[in-house]
């Protein structure tokens, strides 16, 4: 059963990739992205079923085509580089799903656009959050 | 104080076109992404278009894309939008809007011009 | 596209009443609303951005709150200046959209 602790960490982490994941969608969606008609061209897949902590492989497994996209944006738009942002991102989601659990994602039929995809994971953060507290 | 003056609307024929202006006054207008948004009679608002503060982007509602262009002249500070093949169903007032941040989406649109009517009819 | 659904249509209230408006948007859209307050023959007002956040110049009976797909504009204390139509609007993806509107009247 987990501990207090383990679920404060568990908590603490989601927050993070929350964060990151907001900082994202704010760093592309807004007026200032020159780039984002060029984004938006872009398709992610997107989970068939995200409710545990297990349906994150399927955003680890979309991480390296969000780095791809988000090399467009202007590096003022974030505070690290792409590389270094889904890095942290990629430590953060391996500690979270486990990695000695093996789960073979499934996806909807329709893909998405990086808005609808983050947006759909920043759901899943705060859906996990909002059960833990 | 910062205002939007939209003109250019009136009657017009099916198929017909029609330019409409904003202009702005008392802010920054190179530095905004600028809107339209349509309201028809006795019917719910309905965004139409927006632009970035340099033109770089431009998106549309489907029901107007390859019909509707709109545009901007940051030295005139004055807000587009050209109406080709105009159906009756473009029938609405019209209204250009400012975002209310410079950058972020979720401030919404904070100032609006009075509207000008666009009657399409034959 | 998103689209959003307002309930009620339309509701009659006294001056003094607590109302309340809600809006459901197709997907999650975090925390990307808007609500924009208008009376006829006028332009659209601005009330609350970022779901919850008050714009300047708004009364504070004005209030928002909500996020992902259900959101909820309350007006703790209906004032005469009061009665207009409240739409919603989703700010996340373009094409935004509006709700349908609510109309707030007399009762």
């Known amino acids: 059963a987990p501990t207090s602790s383990s679920t404060k960490k568990t908590q603490l982490q989601l927050e993070h990739l929350l964060l990151d994941l907001q900082m994202i969608l704010n760093g592309i969606n807004n007026y200032k992205n020159p780039k984002l008609t060029r984004m938006l061209t872009f398709k992610f897949y997107m989970p068939k079923k995200a409710t545990e902590l297990k349906h994150l492989q399927c955003l680890e497994e979309e991480l390296k085509p969000l780095e791809e996209v988000l090399n467009l944006a202007q590096s003022k738009n974030f505070h690290l580089r792409p590389r270094d942002l889904i890095s942290n991102i990629n430590v953060i989601v391996l500690e979270l799903k486990g990695s000695e659990t093996t789960f073979m994602c499934e996806y909807a039929d329709e893909t998405a656009t990086i808005v609808e995809f983050l947006n759909r994971w920043i759901t899943f953060c705060q859906s996990i959050i909002s059960t833990l507290t | 104080q910062v205002q939007l003056v939209e003109s250019g609307g009136g009657v017009v024929q099916p198929g017909r076109s029609l330019r409409l202006s904003c202009a702005a006054s008392?802010?920054?207008?190179?530095?905004?992404?600028m809107h339209w948004v349509r309201q028809a009679p006795g019917k719910g608002l309905e965004w139409v278009a927006v632009?970035?503060?340099?033109?770089?982007?431009?998106f549309y509602v489907d029901s107007v894309k390859g019909r509707f262009t709109i545009s901007r002249d940051n030295s005139k500070n004055t807000l587009y939008l050209q109406m080709n093949s105009l159906r009756a169903e473009d029938t609405a007032v019209y209204y250009c809007?400012?975002?209310?941040?410079?950058?972020?989406?979720?401030?919404?649109?904070?100032?609006w011009g009075q509207g000008t009517t666009v009657t399409v009819s034959s | 596209d998103i689209q959003m659904t307002q309930s009620p249509s339309s509701v009659s209230a006294s001056v003094g009443d607590r109302v309340t408006i809600t809006c459901r948007a197709s997907?999650?859209?975090?925390?990307?609303l808007v609500w924009y307050q208008q009376k006829p023959g006028k332009p659209p007002k601005l009330l609350i951005y970022?779901?919850?956040s008050l714009q300047n110049g708004v009364p504070s009976r004005f209030s928002g709150s909500g996020s992902g797909t259900d959101f909820t504009l309350t007006i703790s204390s209906l004032q005469t200046e009061d009665f207009a139509t409240y739409y919603c609007?989703?700010?996340?993806?373009?094409?935004?959209?509006f709700g349908p509107g609510t109309k707030v009247e007399v009762k």
């Open positions: 809007a400012r975002p209310g941040s410079d950058y972020y989406f979720y401030y919404g649109m904070d100032v």
């Open positions: 008392g802010f920054t207008f190179s530095s905004y992404g």
């Open positions: 632009i970035w503060y340099d033109g770089s982007n431009k």
């Open positions: 997907q999650g859209i975090s925390n990307w």
């Open positions: 970022a779901a919850s």
């Open positions: 609007q989703q700010a996340l993806s373009f094409p935004w959209t």
